[in-house]
């Protein structure tokens, strides 16, 4: 069952799924000047059996200018460098993590992918929130949201994270809360169902969150 709405927004925060439940769809979006190949699937789907989950279909983009060809256009060196680096970081971070049954990992980037990823989540999906760079957690309760089915309708639970740019000192002296902030998105782009594929955010959030999440929740 697909979740009707986007996960809740938190001002000055962004969210990330550590793993995607089977049934999750990821739109095959291409960046400006490129389009999905004619025979290509409009989305990738997280599917699996009892022992293994993976993304079905592969997203492929081709130049809008190129007619009747599926030739892949090589990304610019700068872009290629960033993608390779971030992909490597993701792989390194995830290598020693236990695979979560019934879930897929973040799909690797595809060439000429759009700068944002649009996911369609399913009931039972959890996403995790983090304050963006330049903001700190004034309050960090459960910084996660779960898509639940209640009375036949889906709803996301409300994360109890408040991010602030104010530098009010703690009223409990000596109690300093570590806050690893990922690179910031512009305010209009934070905390949306659309997640950025400029993987700086995702990988940094992953680096600070995944070990904690997996050790506390799944072991």
């Amino acid at each position: 069952e697909l979740c009707d709405d986007d996960p809740p927004k938190i001002t000055h925060a962004t969210f990330k799924a550590v793993a995607y439940k089977e049934g999750t769809m990821l739109n095959c979006e291409c960046k400006r000047g490129f389009r999905r190949i004619k025979s290509g699937s409009p989305y990738m789907l997280c599917t699996g059996n009892s022992s293994h989950s993976s993304w079905d279909n592969q997203c492929q983009c081709t130049s809008s200018a190129a007619r009747n060809t599926t030739k892949q256009v090589t990304p610019q060196p700068e872009e290629q460098k960033e993608r390779k680096t971030t992909e490597m970081q993701s792989q390194m971070q995830l290598a020693d993590q236990v695979s979560l049954p019934g879930h897929c990992r973040e799909p690797p980037p595809w060439e000429n992918e759009a700068t944002e990823r649009i996911y369609h989540f399913v009931v039972g999906q959890t996403v995790y929130y983090q304050c963006v760079q330049g903001y700190r957690a004034l309050h960090r309760g459960p910084a996660e949201s779960v898509c639940k089915m209640t009375h036949g309708k889906t709803r996301w639970t409300q994360p109890q994270l408040i991010c602030t740019g104010e530098t009010e000192p703690s009223q409990f002296p000596g109690e300093e809360e570590p806050q690893a902030s990922p690179d910031g998105l512009p305010e209009s782009e934070t905390s949306r169902l659309v997640t950025t594929t400029d993987f700086r955010i995702q990988t940094e959030v992953a680096a600070t969150m995944e070990t904690f999440i997996f050790t506390t929740e799944y072991q």
């Epitope: 001002t11 309760g141 602030t164």
Partner: antibody, heavy 115, light 107 residues
């Protein structure tokens, strides 16, 4: 079930200070920030500030900066609001409210400031 | 600070009527908006959060909509127990501010 229980009504003289409490039960107290809101007689709702029940960090509406102090005691799951240099305009019902979306409210504490 | 303006400030309606209350923010607040109902002498009660999500236990005749600067609370079929004052409030960023309230009376 979730409950926020506030301390009883107070009558104060102008210039005095006031400290009211809000005790949370039925949930993990430190999971939810606590807001304070007041309502003058016949008026609307006015946000005073928010405190992290986890870290003790607080943010105040500019109007209350320097005059209001919010604190928490996690051992008793209680949030406090202290207001100094009281004036007649502070006569109001003071509420505590839980979390990002103010999903539960205390019953209110009536404060009367009069000479 | 973000100003929240509600309209109308008061209205009178009959049982079974469809009632709409609007709330306008002075700047874009996305969907960071809540609606509360308050009865005389009682604390406010959360009805809708994040502009359109119905709070637990709230009857389905209540619904919220809108995004950006314009928001609506709708009661599809007014019941006698729906009288009271309704407030909108944003949680976009501190300071959180409330609308001035809409007093709903049953005819």
């Amino acid at each position: 079930q979730v409950q926020l229980v506030q301390s009883g009504a107070e009558v104060k003289k102008p210039g005095a200070s006031l400290k009211i409490s809000c005790k949370g039960s039925g949930y993990t107290f430190t999971d939810y920030a606590m807001h304070w809101v007041r309502q003058a007689p016949g008026q609307g709702l006015e946000w005073i500030g928010v405190i992290s029940t986890y870290s003790g960090d607080a943010i105040y509406a500019q109007k209350f900066q320097g005059r209001a102090t919010m604190t928490v005691d996690t051992s008793t799951s209680t949030a406090y609001l202290e207001l100094s240099s009281l004036r007649s305009e502070d006569t109001a019902v003071y509420y505590c409210a839980r979390g990002v979306t103010f999903d539960y409210w205390g019953q209110g504490t009536t404060v009367t400031v009069s000479s | 600070d973000i100003q929240m303006t509600q309209s109308p400030s008061s209205l009178s309606a009959s049982v079974g009527d469809r009632v709409t209350i609007t709330c306008r923010a002075s700047q874009d607040i996305s969907n960071y908006l809540e609606w509360y109902q308050q009865k005389p002498g009682k604390a406010p009660k959360l009805l809708v959060y994040n502009a359109k999500t119905l709070a637990e236990g709230v009857p389905s005749r209540f619904s919220g909509s809108g995004s950006g600067t314009d928001f609506t609370l709708t009661i599809s079929s007014l019941q006698p127990e729906d009288f009271g004052t309704y407030y909108c409030q944003h949680h976009y960023d501190t300071p959180y501010t409330f609308g001035q309230g809409t007093k709903l009376e049953i005819k």
